[in-house]
Amino acid sequence: DASQSSLTPLMVNGILGESVTLPLEFPAGEKVNFITWLFNETSLAFIVPHETKSPEIHVTNPKQGKRLNFTQSYSLQLSNLKMEDTGSYRAQISTKTSAKLSSYTLRILRQLRNIQVTNHSQLFQNMTCELHLTCSVEDADDNVSFRWEALGNTLSSQPNLTVSWDPRISSEQDYTCIAENAVSNLSFSVSAQKLCGGRSSLEGPRFEGKPIPNPLLGLDSTRTGHHHHHH
């Protein structure tokens, strides 16, 4: 059962700027008199189905009105999602004998964009290089998790990584930042050798990766950094 009783709302993820459908299921074999959709307890739309002609749809919330649509089964479709669409939605299906309530919680998540790494590195006289790397994405919120990996091992569970690299005992080493939320992930790799190579003191550049529309395009090399984008 896709739609839920009011006690346990169905949690639905929407992506900022895209569309989402809140699925509605009808009571089997019963004639529906009307359907009311509510957003945060405020009326959104009132629908009167007809057997022989198109349903009457009264949109009662002008704010979301232009972005509202309904499927043949009166599921709610919301397009061009905004952060303020986050919240509680309810559909009440009224029949001759009963009223069925379906509840939803809509969460709007951002597609992650523009992953970048800032580097502050220091090369010591003993030839070891201390890397201080900071990873960020545009408009990050608490739902974005960051981690740093090298050779499949997690080196950090936060946007920052501090690591020492010794070219005499380590072969070329890539450090990869992975930023992830429920709807997308981005990764960006930097080379220790290129960051530390041949300079006594580095105040490194900022490396930026631009999202690749087609993930199959693979790597986008940007100086000493390269990145992946997944949806």
Epitope: M11, V12, N13, R107, D142, N143, S145, R147, W148, E149, T154, L155, S156, S157, Q158, P159, N160, L161, T162, V163, I178, E180, N181, A182
Partner: antibody, heavy 118, light 108 residues
Framework: QIQLVQSGPDLKNPGKTVKISCKAS????????MNWVKQSPERGLKWMGW????????TYADDFKGQFAFSLETSATTAYLQINNLKNEDTAAYFC???????????WGQGTTLTVSS | EVVLTQSPTTMAASPGEKITVTCSAS???????LHWYQQKPGFSPKLFIY???ILASGVPARFSGSGSGTSFSLTIGAMEAEDVAAYYC?????????FGAGTKLELK
């Protein structure tokens, strides 16, 4: 090996303040965030939030905003949980847990039992 | 928040019996972010199965994990006395991070 050692059990009066410590060893402290988790018979395991051990920035779950404070002593590789204005319902076991990559609670402290009673 | 519903709440099993504990999520979860913890009485929880199906170090091969979307499970191929514990599922992709209420496994 990785170890998280917490301070011992505590008995406090309502209205008082308690500070629980979590001493980390066996890994680079500033590379892995530290979670705090509350466990009580009534509510089970509840994530309280975490602190970024690199820059000290805390993130609190909604239920734990205001009365609770996370802090660090980086040089001592120690994280702290402070609970102010103690209430009876704060009676619980509190755990620190090292954040992993996709695993949020890879290593746990042994827990600190806090009893709030007059 | 994402609610994780575990069932059963308590279960008594005989040695050698096959056990399945389920964890149902109120929102779909990427399999990389669903984990299981074991907690024995008087001890802290311990990471047991991570990323839905990977056994943590030292976990016996009689344990397995599976699932996707909103439905996940932990299975013990043949129950042993040392498996008596509480088992918790946990999701790590939505804030706040949440745990299931736990399944207490006892020996018959």
């Amino acid at each position: 090996q990785i170890q998280l050692v917490q301070s011992g059990p505590d008995l406090k009066n309502p209205g008082k303040t308690v500070k629980i410590s979590c001493k980390a060893s066996g890994y680079t402290f500033t590379n892995f965030g530290m979670n705090w988790v509350k466990q009580s018979p009534e509510r089970g395991l509840k994530w309280m939030g975490w602190i970024n051990t690199y820059n000290g920035k805390p993130t609190y779950a909604d239920d734990f905003k205001g009365q609770f404070a996370f802090s660090l002593e980086t040089s001592a590789t120690t994280a702290y949980l402070q609970i102010n204005n103690l209430k009876n319902e704060d009676t619980a076991a509190y755990f620190c847990a090292k954040r992993g990559g996709t695993v949020d609670f890879g290593y746990w402290g042994q827990g600190t039992t806090l009893t709030v009673s007059s | 928040e994402v609610v994780l519903t575990q069932s059963p709440t308590t279960m008594a099993a005989s040695p050698g019996e096959k056990i399945t504990v389920t964890c149902s999520a109120s929102s779909p979860i990427s399999s990389n972010f669903l984990h299981w913890y074991q907690q024995k009485p008087g001890f802290s929880p311990k990471l047991f199965i991570y990323r839905t199906s990977i056994l943590a170090s030292g976990v016996p091969a009689r344990f397995s994990g599976s699932g996707s979307g909103t439905s996940f499970s932990l299975t013990i191929g043949a129950m042993e006395a040392e498996d008596v514990a509480a088992y918790y599922c946990q999701q790590g992709i939505y804030m706040p991070l949440t745990f299931g209420a736990g399944t207490k496994l006892e020996l018959k």
